[in-house]
C-alpha cells in the first residue's frame, strides 16, 4: 500500500524563516531610528557616545561577501543579546529622564526579544552551532548621573542601528546561499 | 505533503553493520539539518546524530561516538547513518527526524541479536 | 538516565487541566535554549506539539500551551479529551552535547 501519507508542514521552512528574520529586523531598525531620533530631539547629542560595554560593530559591508552562515548568526545573536542586556539596563538604571522614551523602549526590548528567539529557531533548524543563547555577563553599573544615563542611551541605540543595519544586509546576502 | 521513509532496517548480529537511509520529500530538503532519533522498545526518545542543512557539522551522542557517521545526499533528498561495530544496546526503531525536529519519519527497525 | 527529567505519568478526566513538568540544566534548559515538546500516540511516530517554549505549530489546538521559567519548562493541556492520551516528550539542545536532549517521557491517561 506504500508508506502512511506524512506530516502536513507544520512551520516555515527555513529560507521562509530568514525572510521574515529580515522582516522583523528591518522593522526593528525602523524603530531604533525612530527612537534614536526621539532621544535626539529632547537630549541632543554633543558628538559621538560610546559605552565600552557595547560590541564592537561586526563587519564592516564591505567584507560582506566573505561571510559564512553559522558565523553571521552566532555573532548577530551574541551582539545582539549584548543590546538586549543593555537596553533592559537603561530601562532600569537609566533615570528619570529616559522615562519619556517608555513605551517604545519596552517594545523595542521585546521586539529585539522576539528577534533574537527567531535566530535561535533559525539555527536549530539548520543545525548550526549554537552558543548558548543566555551567557552569564558581568553586571552593567549603574549611570554616574542623569546625563550619563543620556549619554548611554545615545551610544546604546546609534549602536544598535549600525548593527541591525549590518544584519539587515548579512541576512539578505546569507539567504542566496542557503 | 512532508515525507520521510527510512529504510534499511533489520536483523543483525553483535559487532556487524547496517546502513539505514531516509529518503525524504515535501519539502527542501538542503535548507534543514537532519537528526537520527532512537526509541528503544517500551522506552524514551533518544538522539542519535545530527547533521547540518550543508553537511559540514555533525555531531553524535555519547552512546555511538566512533561507531555510527551520519552523512546525507542534497542531491538525491536522502540522509544516511552507516552503523557499525552494533551492540544488542542499539536495538531501536530508528526515526530520521528533520529541522528542531519538526518532522519525523515513521521509523525502521534495527534488532541486534544473536 | 534522561538529561531532562519528566514526571513518568500523569493523568486527568475529560475537560480537566493538567500540567507535565520539564526540569534540565544549565546547559541546557537553563543555559537559554528553546524547549520543544512532541506528542507520541500509541504506535506512531512523534509528532511535534509545541517549539519555542510555547509555539503551536499549525494544526495544532490552542488546548496545547507551553511555557518555560528558569531551568525548568512545562506542557498544559486544558479541556483534556480521549484523543490527548499519548506519552509526551520534552526537548532542548544541550551547549555540552551540541544537539538536543530528551525528558523521558510522559504517559498521559485520560480517565
Known amino acids: 500500500p506504500g508508506p502512511p501519507p506524512g506530516p502536513p508542514r507544520v512551520s516555515p521552512d527555513p529560507r521562509a524563516e530568514l525572510d521574515s528574520t529580515v522582516l522583523l529586523t528591518r522593522s526593528l531598525l525602523a524603530d531604533t531610528r525612530q527612537l534614536a531620533a526621539q532621544l535626539r530631539d529632547k537630549f541632543p547629542a554633543d558628538g559621538d557616545h560610546n559605552l565600552d560595554s557595547l560590541p564592537t560593530l561586526a563587519m564592516s559591508a564591505g567584507a560582506l561577501g566573505a561571510l559564512q552562515l553559522p558565523g553571521v548568526l552566532t555573532r548577530l545573536r551574541a551582539d545582539l543579546l549584548s543590546y538586549l542586556r543593555h537596553v533592559q539596563w537603561l530601562r532600569r538604571a537609566g533615570g528619570s529622564s529616559l522615562k519619556t522614551l517608555e513605551p517604545e523602549l519596552g517594545t523595542l526590548q521585546a521586539r529585539l526579544d522576539r528577534l533574537l528567539r527567531r535566530l535561535q529557531l533559525l539555527m536549530s533548524r539548520l543545525a548550526l552551532p549554537q552558543p548558548p543563547p543566555d551567557p552569564p555577563a558581568p553586571p552593567l553599573a549603574p549611570p554616574s548621573s542623569a546625563w550619563g544615563g543620556i549619554r548611554a542611551a545615545h551610544a546604546i541605540l546609534g549602536g544598535l542601528h549600525l548593527t541591525l543595519d549590518w544584519a539587515v544586509r548579512g541576512l539578505l546576502l546569507l539567504k542566496t546561499r542557503l | 505533503e512532508v515525507q520521510l521513509l527510512e529504510s534499511g532496517g533489520g536483523l543483525v548480529q553483535p559487532g556487524g553493520s547496517l546502513r539505514l537511509s531516509c529518503a525524504a520529500s515535501?519539502?527542501?530538503?538542503?535548507?534543514?539539518?537532519m537528526h537520527w532519533v532512537r526509541q528503544a522498545p517500551g522506552k524514551g526518545l533518544e538522539w542519535v546524530s545530527v547533521?547540518?542543512?550543508?553537511?559540514?557539522?555533525?555531531y553524535y551522542a555519547d552512546s555511538v561516538k566512533g561507531r555510527f557517521t551520519i552523512s546525507r545526499d542534497n542531491s538525491k533528498n536522502t540522509l544516511y547513518l552507516q552503523m557499525n561495530s552494533l551492540r544488542a544496546e542499539d536495538t531501536a526503531v530508528y526515526y530520521c527526524?528533520?529541522?528542531?525536529?519538526?518532522?519525523w519519519g515513521q521509523g525502521t527497525l534495527v534488532t541486534v541479536s544473536s | 538516565q534522561s538529561v531532562l527529567t519528566q514526571p513518568p505519568s500523569a493523568s486527568g478526566t475529560p475537560g480537566q487541566r493538567v500540567t507535565i513538568s520539564c526540569t534540565g540544566s544549565?546547559?541546557?534548559?537553563?543555559?537559554?535554549?528553546?524547549v520543544h515538546w512532541y506528542q507520541q500516540l500509541p504506535g506512531t511516530a512523534p509528532k511535534l506539539l509545541i517549539y519555542?517554549?510555547?509555539e503551536r505549530p499549525s494544526g495544532v489546538p490552542d488546548r496545547f500551551s507551553g511555557s518555560k521559567s528558569g531551568t525548568s519548562a512545562s506542557l498544559a493541556i486544558s479541556g483534556l479529551r480521549s484523543e490527548d492520551e499519548a506519552d509526551y516528550y520534552c526537548?532542548?539542545?544541550?551547549?555540552?552535547?551540541?544537539?538536543?536532549?530528551f525528558g523521558g517521557g510522559t504517559k498521559l491517561t485520560v480517565l
Open positions: 547533521i547540518s542543512y550543508d553537511g559540514s557539522y555533525k
Open positions: 544549565s546547559s541546557n534548559i537553563g543555559a537559554g535554549y528553546d
Open positions: 527526524a528533520a529541522g528542531v525536529p519538526d518532522y
Open positions: 515535501g519539502f527542501t530538503f538542503s535548507s534543514y539539518g
Open positions: 526537548a532542548a539542545w544541550d551547549g555540552s552535547l551540541n544537539g538536543p536532549v
Open positions: 519555542s517554549n510555547n
